[in-house]
């Protein structure tokens, strides 16, 4: 899996989308997890409704929401009030049994709010981005 980069501005919301084959993943719940280290486990942040038919209902865990368009084949994750500590590697996952198949690997980057200079030292600025092979950037 290539890594797709999503960039958001600190304090604002960031929407991450993960497309998938709706028939291939039919009946499967989805999840959003945070990668702990390069080869560490992916820690579950939030998952879709326990009843697959209700996957369209938005579920929240703290400032992170998840909703699944099971017919269209798009999983959407919203990170509300984006903070510097939200930056990092994540995965969209498709679940069956206790198995989790990766739908997309996501790098979340937090950009400085141009109107807020208070914590500028903690924030990532364009130009300091790590290079990701075949990375696709979405705003």
């Amino acid at each position: 899996h290539n890594t797709t980069v999503f960039q958001g501005v600190a304090g604002q919301s960031l929407q991450v989308s993960c497309p998938y084959d709706s028939m291939k993943h039919w009946g499967r719940r989805k999840a959003w997890c945070r990668q702990l280290g390069e080869k560490g486990p992916c820690q579950r942040v939030v998952s879709t409704h326990n009843l697959w038919l209700l996957s369209f209902l938005r579920r929240w865990n703290g400032s992170t929401a998840i909703t699944d368009d099971t017919l269209g084949g798009t999983l959407t994750i919203t990170l509300r009030n984006l903070q510097p500590h939200d930056a990092g590697l994540y995965q969209c996952q498709s679940l069956h049994g206790s198995e989790a198949d990766t739908l997309r690997k996501v790098l979340v980057e937090v950009l400085a709010d141009p109107l807020d200079h208070r914590d500028a030292g903690d924030l990532w600025f364009p130009g300091e981005s790590e290079s990701f092979e075949d990375a696709h950037v979405e705003h």
Epitope: D21, M23, K24, G27, R28, R29, W52, G97, S98, E99
Partner: antibody, heavy 121, light 107 residues
Amino acid sequence: QVQLQESGPELVKPGASVKISCKASGYIFSYSWMNWVKQRPGKGLEWIGRIYPGDGDADYNGKFKGKATLTADKSSNTAYMQLTSLTSEDSAVYFCARLHIYDGYYVSVYWGQGTLVTVSA
Amino acid sequence: DIQMTQTTSCLSASLGDRVTISCRASQDINNYLSWYQQKPDGTVKLLIYYTSKLHSGVPSRFSGSGSGTDYSLTIGNLEQEDVATYFCQQGDTLPWTFGGGTRLEIK
């Protein structure tokens, strides 16, 4: 109704390869995962792997990696399993089965009749 | 891999009996357990999924129960057509694994 018709019995020599087929009817072949299971004479069942005919994506039991290769032909609604470097341990009945997802996990709902593969010099 | 153990390989019972077949997993499988019936002619059918849910068309004399690592299949009123081998299978974790099977005979 759903039917899975497997190919006929095979007698093959040690070291040779065999390709068995499973023709599906009664449902949209491309949209369901297909399972493959091995049963040695008088023994239990072993999961070999599964394939999604829509894009050819396959998952294997580590024990069968390098031994079995799963493919599918959407135009003929047929799933195939090729077994290579055959030994007597590969003598078995091989089943294909259509997978359904129920309550969040996969279940083999419809099974083929099985193909007997005999490896003998 | 998760090991599935059916301790009884062969079971003999009389028509009308209540028969229970057990299956144990080497770790918690979260109720992701299915039961299959293989008739003497080799045909395989799904009986029960998710521990206790009866597949459509399966007679109500079949039932399943269990949790964690211990599961069972019960046939409430044994009939001649129930002569078969019964396999449990876990669908929790890849690779999916089966029990060794329990062959059911009529006394």
